[in-house]
């Protein structure tokens, strides 16, 4: 799913207030709901009819530093016999997410939001049929 | 997938530098990769063997204000005949994502990161069999 554009109005002060100096704003330390938990079913990436693998990307100047990307293992889906069926398609499910980018020059540290496209997993779909012409 | 805890070290200045005053830091306005595009297949939520619906939640003090949550339509998966097969399971694929929470008192505006658990879609899995003892 797509994150709408900011239009940057979200980060502006009300019109009646003095503008933010230097094009930056105050970000409080600490994260709300930091102990939130993902309750995904065990090993769904292997048990799915559209199985996937995970690749981890690491960047120490990004929060979170670790971003996990899924890759569908097959073009088709796995049928009840455990065989690949290419009349169906394994397709990636993508999500736009925000990360925080850290920029520093000596003791001057600033942060900026960054959009990252994450493939979260795969699902099995009936393909769009473009019948033989 | 789970976002690891910050440990808040990410947002701290190097040890040799003076600490951040008032427990806040500088967040630059603007978003890197704002024009990133999601290239998800058309109508996958309806064409999937584990179809889902979307619900939109809206909060003007959150960025993005709109967060879309998926809900699996069925317990089972849709078979080749278009019927639900409860020998398989539709399960949610979840992703932890960051949003920005806006807090204001008069002209004083600050922001804080918040973790949100998003169900991005559903996938069809072979259920875990718990044999009768």
């Amino acid at each position: 799913r797509k994150i709408p554009k900011v239009g940057h109005t979200f980060f502006q002060k009300p019109e009646s207030c003095p503008p933010v100096p230097g094009g930056s704003m105050k970000l409080d330390i600490g994260i709300i709901n930091e102990n939130q938990r993902v309750s995904m079913s065990r090993n769904i990436e292997s048990r799915s009819t559209s199985p996937w693998n995970y690749t981890v990307t690491w960047d120490p100047n990004r929060y979170p530093s670790e971003v996990v990307q899924a890759q569908c293992r097959n073009l088709g889906c796995i049928n009840a016999q455990g065989k690949e069926d290419i009349s169906m398609n394994s397709v990636p499910i993508q999500q736009e997410t925000l990360v925080v980018r850290r920029k520093h020059q000596g003791c001057s540290v600033s942060f900026q939001l960054e959009k990252v496209l994450v493939t979260v997993g795969c699902t099995c779909v009936t393909p769009v049929i473009h019948h033989v012409q | 997938r789970k976002i690891p805890k910050v440990g808040h070290t990410f947002f701290q200045k190097p040890e040799s530098c003076p600490p951040v005053p008032g427990g806040s830091m500088k967040l630059d306005i603007g978003i890197i990769n704002e024009n990133q595009r999601v290239s998800m297949s058309r109508n996958i939520e309806s064409r999937s063997t584990s179809p889902w619906n979307y619900t939109v939640t809206w909060d003007p003090n959150r960025y993005p204000s709109e967060v879309v949550q998926a809900q699996c339509r069925n317990l089972g998966c849709i078979n080749a005949q278009g019927k639900e097969d409860i020998s398989m399971n539709s399960v949610p694929i979840q992703q932890e994502t960051l949003v920005v929470r806006r807090k204001h008192q008069g002209c004083s505006v600050s922001f804080q990161l918040e973790k949100v658990l998003v169900t991005v879609g559903c996938t069809c899995v072979t259920p875990v069999i718990h044999h009768v003892q």
């Epitope: 088709g76 290419i86 019948h131 033989v132 | 297949s41 080749a80």
Partner: antibody, heavy 118, light 112 residues
Framework: QFQLVQSGAEVKKPGASVKVSCKAS????????LNWVRQAPGKGLEWMGV????????SYNQKFKDRVTMTVDTSTSTVYMELSSLRSEDTAVYYC???????????WGQGTLVTVSS | DIVMTQSPLSLSVTPGQPASISCRSS???????????LHWYLQKPGQPPQLLIY???NRFSGVPDRFSGSGSGTDFTLKISRVEAEDVGVYYC?????????FGQGTKLEIK
């Protein structure tokens, strides 16, 4: 008009790799899978695998699984088939073929002759 | 892998006469979705194969109506009602119900 234009003939030594390209035009590239089928001189047709141009997902014939790699470049509407550890029995014409789900392989490239000889 | 067996492997036909090619698969080609993914191709000398019939009995665009396909399960037939000189070449049956996709060994049609 639909067209699949393949790269030219190649001569390779045993143990080498070959990469054949196939450029599609005349239709929406990401709407159709592309297969690779080969035909040894005077012999029948053998399916090697298929790639989904939109996602880059693949399905390979197990016979070639460890030696074949299919890739896609959507910016140029081109798919590639790389075959490694070539042996003399890989001498064949390699065809790139458009495939519509459950219908059939409806349009074929002109073929690329790969000769493996020491 | 599904084995596709064609017969005869060659046939010589007088122009205007009918011809028939049989194709048998080692397993049923009926998919769980009800479709049967059995197709016929013709490879003319010095050319890539071309699609004639898809899903047992559907003629591809531009294919003359003298070509017809029939069959079900594991037994399939391609018929040419009146053979013409341009029909020479090798005919292949192929299945795409199961991975890997497989082809018959080919039937060579010649004109007497």
């Amino acid at each position: 008009q639909f067209q699949l234009v393949q790269s030219g003939a190649e001569v390779k030594k045993p143990g080498a790799s070959v990469k054949v390209s196939c450029k599609a035009s005349g239709y929406t590239f990401t709407d159709y899978n592309l297969n690779w089928v080969r035909q040894a001189p005077g012999k029948g047709l053998e399916w090697m695998g298929v790639i989904h141009p939109d996602y880059g997902t693949t399905s390979y014939n197990q016979k070639f699984k460890d030696r074949v790699t299919m890739t896609v470049d959507t910016s140029t509407s081109t798919v590639y088939m790389e075959l490694s550890s070539l042996r003399s029995e890989d001498t064949a014409v390699y065809y790139c073929v458009r495939y519509d789900y459950g219908d059939a392989m409806d349009y074929w490239g002109q073929g690329t002759l790969v000769t493996v000889s020491s | 892998d599904i084995v596709m067996t064609q017969s005869p492997l060659s046939l010589s036909v007088t122009p205007g006469q009918p011809a028939s090619i049989s194709c048998r698969s080692s397993q049923s080609l009926v998919h769980s979705n009800g479709n049967t993914y059995l197709h016929w191709y013709l490879q003319k000398p010095g050319q890539p194969p071309q699609l004639l019939i898809y899903k047992v009995s559907n003629r591809f665009s531009g294919v003359p109506d003298r070509f017809s396909g029939s069959g079900s399960g594991t037994d399939f037939t391609l018929k040419i009602s009146r053979v013409e000189a341009e029909d020479v070449g090798v005919y292949y049956c192929s299945q795409s119900t199961h991975v890997p996709l497989t082809f018959g060994q080919g039937t060579k049609l010649e004109i007497k």
